[in-house]
């Protein structure tokens, strides 16, 4: 289960746009042993993104994260700076992978689908806890996300790694419960759907959850990277990770140059992931997608899938 | 078209508390935040928190912490602010607002609710 | 929490008149400002964000610009309709702050 301590697992070559701090609940930093130093950000609805550590916005988005997680650990709360070796966060099951992100399979296993099931680790985080996060990183918790500009214009350009799925009942939250706030975010074209960080203790009531509806690409994101235009995601969704395409749809079109290699070490049976697969089905990538990796989804921590749409994801609640 | 349609004026006494909806049509009602600010008379504008209607997760505006209570109904794409123990400087015209998911500008408002405290 | 400051706090100015609305901010909010107009008695309306990104619908005479701490909202001719109150908005962190607005008047 250990593999490597000094082996680079993520390595990011397309950084992100801005984000805005309050969309963002932590960040972490790749080893030194991948070279080129980039910040992993993530966000309200789960997603990491590359950043660059040299630009000013991150910079103060690490510092402002780091201020809170000091808040919230004056406050009761529990956090934890992990450096070491980074390895696959263990909450996340499904998510969307932009085309800077390959997986690099470090094992194979004999089933073809992830069944992770909830834990605890929703509440951690909700108290401010980090328990997934990959160790071998300086890492830090902070809070919330997401703005949208304009009708549908594309999102950050960045390095979307790995997006986790949401739950789509509605809950009652009394300010003040302690919690990590839902999703938000600017850069996918096709979904909006939100995690499943609700805090049980604060959960007054849950709503029921709304009737699949016609999506609207993109529906609730608008973008900050400057002017480019999403092209409309497909419903991606599958049950057998076979080669993992670019995954671009909601970010400037970029080359298959424009990669980041995530190598995902496996989880061992112990791990208990927090959230529920979002995919099932099968799904052929687009021609013009460079397939950048093959995995078994067995063994991953971290079940890389394209976002699927937000109602498809609520069918399957 | 979208439309966020908020409950009518409530009076209310030093103390009380009031609930606030915002029904919302002519979008997903899950795929975006609800934000709630509120203007005092002749003032300016101040956020008091968001929900999240796809998860109900929230965020408040610290100075509003432990009297907010923000709900959303899915069912029905409607989203609640409750404030308790109200003085008379809560005295304002409470806005829902619609916050896309890439960041928290508020492109759709409510008509506003106006709120008084008196006793 | 950051502050922004908006100036002038009410001007008045002529229908086809060019006019230039300021905000600060007490930190660096990376341009993720907003932009809102709001007349008497209504909800404010959503216009500029990103710093310059135009609402939809709204007309092109408004613009928005800005780095850092400093942003501006300019109306390039300003129209009968354009005579309302301007607030900004910085969604770069928590809390959300709003400028004190600008009242634009006729002259």
């Known amino acids: 289960q250990h593999h490597g301590v000094t082996k680079c697992n993520i390595t990011c070559s397309k950084m992100t746009s801005k984000i805005p701090v309050a969309l963002l609940i932590h960040y972490q930093q790749n080893q030194a042993s991948c070279g080129k130093r980039a910040i992993i950000l993530e966000t309200r609805q789960h997603r990491l993104f590359c950043a660059d550590p040299k630009e000013q916005w991150v910079k103060d988005a690490m510092q402002h994260l780091d201020r809170q997680a000091a808040a919230l650990t004056r406050n009761g709360g529990t956090f934890e700076k992990q450096i070491g070796e980074v390895k696959p966060r263990t909450t996340p099951a499904a998510g969307g992978m932009d085309e800077s992100v390959v997986l690099e399979p470090e094992a194979t296993g004999e089933s073809s689908s992830l069944e992770p099931t909830p834990s605890s680790q929703e509440a951690q985080r909700a108290l401010g806890t980090s328990p997934e996060l990959p160790t071998g990183v300086t890492g830090s918790s902070g809070t919330r996300l997401p703005p949208t500009p304009k009708a549908q214009d594309g999102g950050p350009v960045g390095t979307e790694l790995f997006r986790v799925p949401p739950v789509s009942t509605a809950a009652t939250w009394q300010s003040s419960a302690p919690h990590q706030p839902g999703p938000s975010l600017w850069a996918e074209a096709k979904t909006s759907e939100a995690p499943s960080t609700q805090d049980p203790s604060t959960q007054a009531s849950t709503a029921s959850s709304p009737a699949p509806e016609e999506n609207a690409p993109s529906e609730g994101q608008r973008v900050w990277g400057q002017g480019q235009s999403p092209r409309p995601e497909n419903s991606l969704e599958r049950e057998e990770m076979g080669p993992v395409p670019a995954h671009t749809d909601a970010f400037q079109d970029w080359g298959p140059g424009s990669m980041a290699h995530v190598s995902v070490v496996p989880v061992s049976s112990e791990g208990t992931p927090s959230r529920e697969p979002v995919a099932s089905g099968s799904w052929t990538p687009k021609a013009e997608e460079p397939i950048h990796a093959t995995m078994d989804p067995q063994r991953l921590g971290v079940l890389i899938t394209p976002v699927p749409d937000a109602q498809a994801a609520t069918r399957r609640q | 078209q979208v439309q966020l349609v908020q409950s009518g004026a409530e009076v209310k006494k030093p103390g009380a508390s009031v609930k606030v909806s915002c029904k919302a049509s002519?979008?997903?009602?899950?795929?975006?935040?609800i934000h709630w600010v509120r203007q005092a008379p002749g003032q300016g504008l101040e956020w008091i928190g968001w929900i999240y209607p796809g998860d109900g997760s929230p965020k408040f505006n610290e100075r509003f912490k432990g009297r907010t209570t923000m709900t959303a109904d899915t069912s029905t794409s409607t989203a609640y602010m409750e404030l308790s123990s109200l003085r008379s400087e809560d005295t304002a015209v409470y806005f829902c607002?619609?916050?896309?998911?890439?960041?928290?500008?508020?492109?759709?408002w409510g008509q506003g609710t106006t709120v008084t405290v008196s006793s | 929490d950051i502050q922004m400051t908006q100036s002038p706090s009410s001007l008045s100015a002529s229908v086809g008149d060019r006019v230039t609305i300021t905000c600060r901010a007490s930190g660096n909010i990376h341009n993720f400002l907003a932009w809102y107009q709001q007349k008497p008695g209504k909800a404010p309306k959503f216009l500029v964000y990103?710093?310059?990104t135009l609402a939809d619908g709204v007309p092109s005479r408004f613009s928005g610009s800005g780095s850092g701490t400093q942003y501006t909202l300019t109306i390039s001719s300003l129209q009968p309709e354009d005579f309302a109150t301007y607030f900004c908005q910085q969604f770069w962190s928590t809390p959300y702050t709003f400028g004190g607005g600008t009242k634009v008047e006729i002259k």
């Open positions: 607002a619609r916050g896309p998911t890439d960041g928290d500008y508020f492109d759709y």
């Open positions: 002519g979008y997903t009602f899950t795929n975006y935040y």
């Open positions: 990103n710093e310059k």
